[in-house]
């Protein structure tokens, strides 16, 4: 069944790589079990960034190794992927899958475009 | 503190209908789904079915359908089971249990008795 | 419908010695996101069940680390390492992967 995934147009990641923005979905109702994954769409290629399961007793909990960390509350996500270069540059989809109880819905944000610019270098100083 | 307190329970006639509920309070209602479990005299758990309190739609154990009911009064956070053309063997203790992905609150059970 | 099956339907147990309890489901209970959804309850006389392992193997918050669940597929097993006295009661496995969610017809345990 589909569903609604709302998400900001642009963000502009910081000097250190770091984005961050909500992604918001259509009322989980007696959703427990919930799956936001972050995809990078490149062209006509799309590719998962990091992808995580929580449920309404627990918090978001991203692999250790991801290069994604979260939070939820409700109907929100907010989301922080970390390390980015500026050839990270690019549209990231939120996509949201409440996977428990059924039925099982799916939505998909339009993407947030990221803009990542990597800080000048330091000159060297005499 | 999350809550579910049951009340309803009686002896009925063969044939006769009841209405139980289950109170719920500490949490938010439509958050989370709410099932009925029946208990006859000295057997085990029987899952009747349980009730999307979002969408206010049922599901249904085979052995539950058509003669049980389920519904909601959002408003005052209660869940209810209504129960007709009752028979000896609907003798039990009814339960009301909340589920994310397992029941970690339960009512305290309310006992129906079917008797002439 | 999936059938659980327990077994066995009493055991006896003395204090400090280890009790198991089998549950066999009649088809996988794998559900379609590849979780599977099997708890244990534990029931004493004129009391509301209460939940020890969700998800097969996870201990819910307070319950003894004395207690721990293990499995896969169609089998899965409840284990106490070493049963106490406040242990007696009927304790029941339950699927919720698959509609209609369903129970096992429960395990007795007493302690001598």
């Known amino acids: 069944k589909g569903m609604h995934a709302a998400q900001p147009a642009v963000v502009l990641a910081s000097s250190r790589g770091v984005a961050s923005f909500v992604c918001e979905y259509g009322s989980s109702g007696n959703a427990a079990e919930v799956r936001v994954t972050m995809l990078r769409q490149a062209g006509s290629q799309m590719t998962e960034v990091c992808a995580a399961t929580y449920t309404v007793e627990d918090e978001l909990a991203f692999l250790d190794d991801s290069t994604c960390t979260g939070t939820s509350s409700g109907n929100k996500v907010n989301l922080t992927i970390q390390g980015l270069r500026a050839m990270g540059t690019g549209l990231y989809i939120c996509k949201v899958e409440l996977m428990y109880p059924p039925p099982y819905y799916v939505g998909m944000g339009n993407g947030t475009q990221i803009y990542v610019i990597d800080p000048e270098p330091c000159p060297d100083s005499d | 503190e999350i809550q579910l307190v049951q009340s309803g329970g009686d002896l009925v006639k063969p044939g006769g209908s009841l209405r139980l509920s289950c109170k719920a309070s500490?949490?938010?209602?439509?958050?989370?789904?709410m099932n009925w479990v029946r208990q006859a005299p000295g057997k085990g758990l029987q899952w009747m079915g349980w009730i999307n309190t979002y969408t206010g739609e049922p599901t249904y154990a085979d052995d539950f359908k058509g003669r049980f009911t389920f519904s909601l009064d959002n408003a005052k956070n209660t869940l209810y089971l209504q129960m007709n053309s009752l028979r000896a063997e609907d003798t039990a203790v009814y339960f009301c249990?909340?589920?994310?992905?397992?029941?970690?609150?339960w009512g305290q059970g309310t006992t129906l008795t079917v008797s002439s | 419908d999936i059938v659980m099956t327990q077994t066995p339907l009493s055991l006896s147990v003395s204090p400090g010695e280890p009790a198991s309890i089998s549950c066999r489901s009649s088809?996988?209970?794998?559900?379609?996101?590849?979780?599977?959804?099997l708890e244990w309850y534990q029931q004493k006389p004129g009391q509301s069940p209460k939940l020890l392992i969700y998800k097969v193997s996870n201990r819910f918050s307070g319950v003894p680390d004395r207690f721990s669940g293990s499995g896969s597929g169609t089998d899965f097993t409840l284990r106490i390492s070493r049963v106490e006295a406040d242990d007696a009661g009927v304790y029941y496995c339950?699927?919720?992967?698959?509609?209609?969610?369903?129970f096992g017809g429960g395990t007795k345990l007493e302690i001598k």
């Open positions: 088809q996988s209970i794998v559900y379609s996101n590849g979780n599977t959804y």
């Open positions: 339950f699927q919720g992967s698959h509609v209609p969610w369903t």
């Open positions: 500490g949490y938010t209602f439509t958050n989370y789904g």
């Open positions: 249990a909340r589920r994310s992905i397992y029941y970690p609150y």
